[in-house]
Interface confidence: medium
């Protein structure tokens, strides 16, 4: 019955290709374990593995958790894609004072230009408002509201904008939930710093320093402090800690100031597809009869790239512990080996880097 999808007619003699009448051409057949990314793949790079939802395939061909934009002061700029993380940015009316990988660790409200100053450059998600002295010909009422945003009477804007931090709740660090009115009120309560007449709201020299932890002069113990659920990576950037919110994950180590949270599969499951600081796919741990216990093959004997097994497959079994319970999972970085002995005749190793799908076809992770 599937005559609308024949493969034979014109690609004989080349087992790595099939004929697709729908597109009237020969198509490359992806090796077992990889999925086509388009209806008619043409080359090995048109076959790829796919990570679990909310994970992306990084440059090292690893499944890595996409950052989350769940904080009140963040919005999603670009979604989580198969080969790139979700990107978060500060919501409208705010700018990023402490950047993080694919996100922002700390957002501040845009400053409001004081009396006698006008907006030179409006604030963006990345930069604060830049003010400049009003031209002599411009009236206090201003020609355009866009170029003259005066604060409420009796207030004097300052250089340091109001931070928005979910971790604090003082008057100077109001939560974002109040909406636009709150943002305007917060901005209007700023006072102007004497040393910054033309760039109101310019961040301090290290906006990532916690205002609650001043740095004593000469002190070497003055480090950047990231927002909650972010950590300071080796490059000195605030990076989002991975989330263990999936049902099959539990937290192994918490999110610390200098290290990510790490997740592992919940008891009774084992990691089949590892991800940075987490596991992209957990599978039930096999419970085997004693006679079926096998030892993993010596990896040196194999000549192919190793990948984790899929949903529905399991590692070579280990005997169930004496208490009869399935063992807890391995660490997130420990993956299983597929019982796959792809021979030298395979066109590509099954973990070759690959190209973007033009069809949006879901494909599966090879590990």
């Amino acid at each position: 019955f599937p005559q609308d999808r024949p493969f034979e007619d014109t690609c004989h003699g080349n087992p790595s290709h099939y004929y697709d009448k729908a597109v009237r051409r020969c198509c490359y057949r992806c090796p077992m374990g990889l999925f086509p990314t388009q209806q008619c793949p043409q080359r090995p790079t048109d076959c790829r593995k796919q990570c679990e939802p909310d994970y992306y395939l990084d440059e090292a061909d690893r499944c890595t958790a996409c950052v989350t934009c769940s904080r009140d002061d963040l919005v999603e700029k670009t979604p989580c894609a198969w080969n790139s993380s979700r990107v978060c940015e500060c919501r409208p009316g705010m700018f990023c004072s402490t950047s993080a990988v694919n996100s922002c660790a700390r957002c501040f409200f845009h400053s409001v230009c004081p009396a006698g100053m006008i907006v030179k450059f409006p604030g963006t998600a990345q930069k604060n408002t830049v003010c400049e002295p009003a031209s002599p010909g411009v009236s206090p009422a201003c020609a355009s509201p866009e170029n003259c945003k005066e604060p409420s009477s009796g207030t004097i804007p300052q250089a340091k904008p109001t931070p928005v931090s979910p971790a604090t709740s003082s008057a100077s660090t109001m939560p974002v939930r109040g909406g636009t009115r709150l943002a305007q009120e917060a901005a209007s309560k700023l006072t102007r710093a004497p040393d910054s007449p033309s760039s109101v709201g310019r961040p301090s020299s290290d906006p990532g320093l916690s205002p609650t932890q001043p740095c004593p002069e000469g002190s070497g113990d003055c480090r950047k402090q990231c927002e909650p659920d972010y950590y300071l990576d080796e490059a000195g950037r605030c990076t989002a800690c991975v989330s263990c919110s999936r049902d099959d994950l539990v937290e192994k180590t918490p999110c610390a100031w200098n290290s990510s949270r790490t997740c592992e599969c919940r008891p009774g499951m084992i990691c089949a597809t590892s991800a940075t600081n987490s596991c992209a796919r957990c599978v039930p741990y096999p419970i085997c009869a004693a006679e079926t216990v096998t030892k993993p093959q010596d990896m040196a004997e194999k000549d192919t790239t190793f990948e984790a097994p899929p949903l529905g497959t399991q590692p070579d079994c280990n005997p169930t512990p004496e208490n009869g319970e399935a063992p807890a999972s391995t660490s997130p970085t420990q993956s299983l080996l597929v019982d796959s002995q792809a021979s030298k005749t395979l066109p590509i190793p099954t973990s070759a880097p690959v190209a973007l799908s033009s069809t949006g076809k879901p494909v599966l992770d090879a590990g």
Epitope: F7, P15, R29, F35, K49, P53, L346
Partner: antibody, heavy 118, light 108 residues
């Protein structure tokens, strides 16, 4: 016309072995990933094992891993399933199926019955 | 028990429209194609729907598939007596294949 014909089923005692064969015709066998799917009496379908075209990788369900071995002989257009350490729960009709390029099963054989009983 | 959940049975009268559901999770249906197979009594399964909603030639357009989030459904309109069969949803994977438990459709 694409045809898949399974053979080798029968009655075997627990712990015993059987080798199933699937003779393929009507298509270029060496160009296709192949698979075995089974169905216990009165039950649903269960994927058992798959093998890549050429001499591609082999994959197994957790329920048979370490006991079953899938293989193919492209010169004979034949797919095999070597089943060792058979258990009562392996009793089923075993179907040979051809993977389409997107991993659907576009053609199936008629199946061969394997009964594991003492 | 299958990780893809189907109702064990469904029924309808000739001419009626019947829908069979298949529920999964983000790690199976949510991130993969869904397939539907029809197994008439005493025969091998037959591919009915591939890639969520595509029909192979020879399959009447009375059969349609859809997918939304972590669930999928097979709709059969203008039900006929010859549609009485077991229907299985499945999710493709390069390494394995996950079938639903199956739904027995009875044409009353």
């Amino acid at each position: 016309e694409v045809q898949l014909l399974e053979s080798g089923g029968g009655l075997v005692q627990p712990g015993g072995s059987l080798r199933l064969s699937c003779a393929a015709s009507g298509f270029t066998f060496s160009s296709y990933h192949m698979s075995w799917v089974r169905q216990a009496p009165g039950k649903g379908l269960e994927w058992v094992s798959g093998i890549g075209y050429g001499h591609g990788g082999t994959y197994y369900a957790d329920s048979v891993k370490g006991r079953f071995t899938i293989s193919r002989d492209n010169s004979k257009n034949t797919l095999y399933l070597q089943m060792n350490s058979l258990r009562a729960e392996d009793t089923a009709v075993y179907y040979c199926a051809r993977y389409d390029y997107d991993y659907s099963f576009d053609y199936w054989g008629q199946g061969t019955l394997v009964t594991v009983s003492s | 028990q299958s990780v893809l959940t189907q109702p064990p049975s469904a029924s309808g009268t000739p001419g009626q429209r019947v829908t069979i559901s298949c529920s999964g999770s983000s790690s199976n249906i949510g991130s993969n194609y869904v397939y539907w197979y029809q197994q008439l009594p005493g025969t091998a399964p037959k591919l009915l729907i591939y890639r969520n909603n595509q029909r192979p030639s020879g399959v009447p357009d009375r059969f349609s598939g859809s997918k939304s989030g972590t669930s999928a459904s097979l709709a059969i309109s203008g039900l006929r007596s010859e549609d009485e069969a077991d229907y299985y949803c499945a999710v493709s994977s390069p390494y394995s294949y996950v079938f639903g438990g199956g739904t027995k459709l009875t044409v009353l």
